[in-house]
């Protein structure tokens, strides 16, 4: 899977959208790597 910063950001945005935004406060692009997915 793509693990560039931009890919990580878009994947996280999708995850946040699907979860209704209910995630940990530190679950932001600069804190998570591609392995978080």
């Amino acid at each position: 899977a793509c693990d560039t910063a931009t890919c990580v950001t878009h994947r996280l945005a999708g995850l946040l959208s699907r979860s209704g935004g209910v995630v940990k406060n530190n679950f932001v692009p600069t804190n998570v790597g591609s392995k978080a997915f």
Partner: antibody, heavy 119, light 107 residues
């Protein structure tokens, strides 16, 4: 409102260095990567690199290694790009850009900084 | 580096028409492609990410499609404000790379 406010135009001599700033507001600066892009007539848009404001980690386009250095100042939510050993080939418009998720999911760009290298 | 080729440097269209801007990647980039619009004298503005997803606020006249190596930005019902340069970008691999741009001219 998310904003990326860049420093003003620069006119510098060949061989000199310059530092361009990009002040972020309206979102949590340390949450999102900051990208830097160059636009010149010759080469269209070129990605220079990105920086993680949270830890200072960087990814550079190999072409710009040794030319550009990316840094941040978390206390002022400002990203910087230093360009060194400037030549006329470095004359271009330089942009900072960041994909933000909160408060609005969008790819925001600064207004651009025009760099002119001339003797 | 991955080369993004926009073979048409200029495209001419009329208000109300439909136009397609194409972009070809030199290797597979999955759907990790964005499209940008740059009006004269302005910064690039993001339109599309992940090949086919519109950012909020982008008119639904703009549609992205494609995967792998071939990508298309289609503008339906072209408006005069669509006069601009359009760039594709891949972010599947470092360094991110952009196409050379397609200038849309309104007749």
């Amino acid at each position: 409102e998310v904003q990326l406010q860049q420093s003003g135009p620069e006119l510098v001599k060949p061989g000199a260095s310059v530092r361009i700033s990009c002040k972020a507001s309206g979102y949590t600066f340390t949450d999102y990567y900051m990208n830097w892009v160059r636009q010149s007539h010759r080469k269209s848009l070129e990605w220079i690199g990105d920086i993680n404001p949270n830890n200072g980690g960087t990814n550079y386009n190999q072409k710009f290694k040794g030319k550009a250095t990316l840094t941040v100042d978390k206390s002022s939510s400002t990203a910087y790009m230093e360009l060194r050993s400037l030549t006329s080939e470095d004359s271009a418009v330089y942009y900072c850009a960041s994909i933000i998720i909160v408060p609005n999911y969008f790819d925001y760009w600064g207004q651009g900084t025009t760099l002119t290298v001339s003797s | 580096d991955i080369v993004m080729t926009q073979s048409q440097k200029f495209m001419s269209t009329s208000v109300g028409d439909r136009v397609s801007v194409t972009c070809k990647a030199s290797q597979n980039v999955d759907t990790n492609v964005a499209w940008f619009q740059q009006r004269p004298g302005q910064s690039p503005k993001a339109l599309i990410y992940s090949a086919s997803y519109r950012y909020s606020g982008v008119p639904d006249r703009f549609t992205g499609s494609g995967s792998g190596t071939d990508f298309t930005l289609t503008i339906s019902n072209v408006q005069s404000e669509d006069l601009a340069d359009y760039f594709c970008q891949q972010y599947n691999n470092y360094p991110y790379t952009f196409g050379g741009g397609t200038k849309l001219e309104i007749e």
